[in-house]
């Protein structure tokens, strides 16, 4: 009588998460009488996966009709595979007894689960940085298997090379995670720029997953300030303009100082956007020259995005303007002529 053989023809089987896995097993003889059981893993800690003899295994079904004695086929199908099902499965023949006696095991079939990576999540720096500075972006994706994965970074469609990528864990696991950090040098033109993290994996059939981050969340473009005086008006009032240009984000506070004293404070809001994503703002102040004996030092003070204030000063030469008899002594006309002009230039 030939020795009983337990045949597991496939050394390995790869299945996509959510699909069913078929694990094949045949025996060369039905003698002696006794059950076939399926285990994951070997040794004392092995996990019972299916026992024809007893138990409730809702995800496992025999491939062949177990009531047909002569088929010798003890293959099983496991439904709704998840990465947690990965491992080596053994088909084991027992001889009936109390307890059942293990006679022979198959060579084992390694089940690997192809699981898609999660959508990459890209996160940028916690604080904004200005042009010429380097900021780091991190991309994370989880739950994929097998371990082999490709990650690329792009900025406005151009591939980046300054990045470091890690796949964890380093050893064998049911699923893996990837984390990559890219270093990006900012320019003043990056308000509308985007970084893209692209993940390619065997489960994605050539259609990579992408995660994006807008550099607008990471960049601060400080404003240019220019204070100019318009020509004298007939009513002895001088129009002084403070042009604040090319700044981002919009969060900006402007304060006019006359000879060091706060004259007016304004907050930027609802500004039109320049083509490059930055903003411009113009504020102007009317100064009644005839009310001053000495030159007036006007300062436009801009506080942008919580940064230290930037000042630009301008002196209005009172001596250059003849005084009007009986003029108002106020340093500033506080009537309706005193106003801001909000303007945007490209």
């Amino acid at each position: 009588e030939e020795e009983l053989q337990v045949i597991q023809p496939e050394k390995s089987v790869s299945v996509a998460a959510g699909d069913s896995a078929t694990l094949n097993c045949t025996v060369s003889s039905l003698i002696p009488v006794g059950p076939i059981q399926w285990f994951r893993g070997a040794g004392p800690g092995r996990e019972l996966i299916y026992n024809l003899k007893e138990g409730h295994f809702p995800r496992v079904t025999p491939v062949s009709d177990p009531t047909k004695r002569n088929n010798m086929d003890f293959s099983i199908r496991i439904s709704n595979i998840t990465p947690a099902d990965a491992g080596t499965y053994y088909c084991v023949k027992f001889r009936k007894g109390s307890p059942d006696v293990e006679l022979k095991s198959g060579a084992g079939t390694e089940l690997s689960v192809r699981a898609k990576p999660s959508a990459p999540v890209v996160s940028g720096p916690a604080v904004r940085a200005t042009a010429e500075h380097t900021v780091s972006f991190t991309c994370e994706s989880h739950g994929f298997s097998p371990r082999d994965i490709t990650l690329k970074w792009f900025k406005n469609g151009n591939e980046l090379s300054d990045f470091q990528t890690n796949v964890d864990p380093a050893g064998k696991s049911v699923s893996y995670s990837i984390r990559s950090t890219a270093r990006v040098v900012l320019t003043r033109r990056d308000v509308h720029s985007q970084v893209i993290c692209e993940v390619a994996h065997v489960t994605l059939q050539g259609d990579p997953l992408r995660g994006t981050a807008n550099l607008s969340e990471a960049i601060r473009v400080p404003p240019f300030l220019e204070v100019t005086q318009q020509s004298m008006r007939a009513d002895n009032q001088v129009n002084v303009t403070c042009q604040v240009t090319k700044f981002y984000p919009q969060r900006l506070q402007l304060t006019w100082l006359e000879n060091g004293n706060v004259s007016r404070t304004e907050m930027a809001s609802a500004l039109p956007e320049n083509k490059d994503g930055t903003y411009n703002w113009t504020s102007w102040l009317l100064v009644n020259v005839s009310a001053h004996r000495d030159d007036v030092k006007l300062t436009c003070q801009v506080e942008h995005d919580g940064q230290p204030a930037v000042n630009k000063s301008f002196s209005v030469k009172v001596s250059a303007h003849p005084k009007e008899q009986g003029s108002n002594t106020a340093a500033e006309n506080t009537g309706t002529n005193e106003r801001n002009i909000y303007g945007g230039s490209g």
Epitope: E1, L30, I31, V33, G34, P35, I36, L52, K53, E54, P66, T67, K68, R69, N70, K96, G97, S98, P99, D100
Partner: antibody
Framework: EVQLVESGGGLVQPGGSLRLSCAAS????????MHWVRQATGKGLEWVSA???????YYTGSVKGRFTISRENAKNSLYLQMNSLRAGDTAVYYC????????????WGQGTMVTVSS | DIQMTQSPSSLSASVGDRVTITCRAS??????LAWFQQKPGKAPKSLIY???SLHSGVPSKFSGSGSGTDFTLTISSLQPEDFATYYC?????????FGQGTKLEIK
């Protein structure tokens, strides 16, 4: 339909012989362990004999050396040759199929009556 | 030989009752225990194998449990067709042996 039909029972004198047959249909008899079980009138069930798929045979102590179980694959039939019959062998004899992998009884024949009496 | 002891030997119950029959083996038989139902003048019918698995076509009102030496058969809600004699059997090793039977009668 899976079915077992026994025949060959009857009245026999003590010391006599009888050959019971069991015709199987709906399955291949040689692929299963097959059994004979008997039941004396008003009594419980008693396992008598078995034949495995490899032709290995088993008997209860009281019939060893007197009864022989066999099968004929070509006829898909099981037999029980009963010699040196005794009054205590009087019973209904059932042919039973053993289950797929553990030999749990699943299919029973309707039985045939054997009476040993002078 | 392994001895199988059933209790009670007989049992009176009413339609709708839940009844339990026990079977004890003289030694550990793992879960290689079967239950059979037999009506007068008929061949036994297989109900349960490996202590708790129902044969095909057997209604779920029948259930079995146990392992080792102590086993039970439970009928959840008796119907008129359930009044019969019930036998347990060990089939872990030859000679296979049966319990003496439990006769379930209508009250």
């Amino acid at each position: 339909e899976v079915q077992l039909v026994e025949s060959g029972g009857g009245l026999v004198q003590p010391g006599g012989s009888l050959r019971l047959s069991c015709a199987a249909s709906g399955f291949t008899l040689s692929s299963y362990d097959m059994h004979w079980v008997r039941q004396a009138t008003g009594k419980g069930l008693e396992w008598v004999s078995a034949i495995g798929t490899a032709g290995d045979t088993y008997y209860t102590g009281s019939v060893k050396g007197r009864f022989t179980i066999s099968r004929e694959n070509a006829k898909n039939s099981l037999y029980l040759q009963m010699n040196s019959l005794r009054a205590g062998d009087t019973a209904v004899y059932y042919c039973v199929r053993g289950g797929v992998w553990d030999d749990a009884f699943d299919i029973w024949g309707q039985g045939t009556m054997v009476t040993v009496s002078s | 030989d392994i001895q199988m002891t059933q209790s009670p030997s007989s049992l009176s119950a009413s339609v709708g009752d839940r009844v339990t029959i026990t079977c004890r083996a003289s030694q550990d038989i793992n879960n290689y225990l079967a239950w059979f139902q037999q009506k007068p003048g008929k061949a036994p019918k297989s109900l349960i194998y490996t202590a708790s698995s129902l044969h095909s076509g057997v209604p779920s009102k029948f259930s079995g449990s146990g392992s080792g030496t102590d086993f039970t058969l439970t009928i959840s809600s008796l119907q008129p067709e359930d009044f019969a004699t019930y036998y347990c059997q060990q089939y872990v090793s030859y000679p296979y042996t049966f319990g003496q039977g439990t006769k379930l009668e209508i009250k």
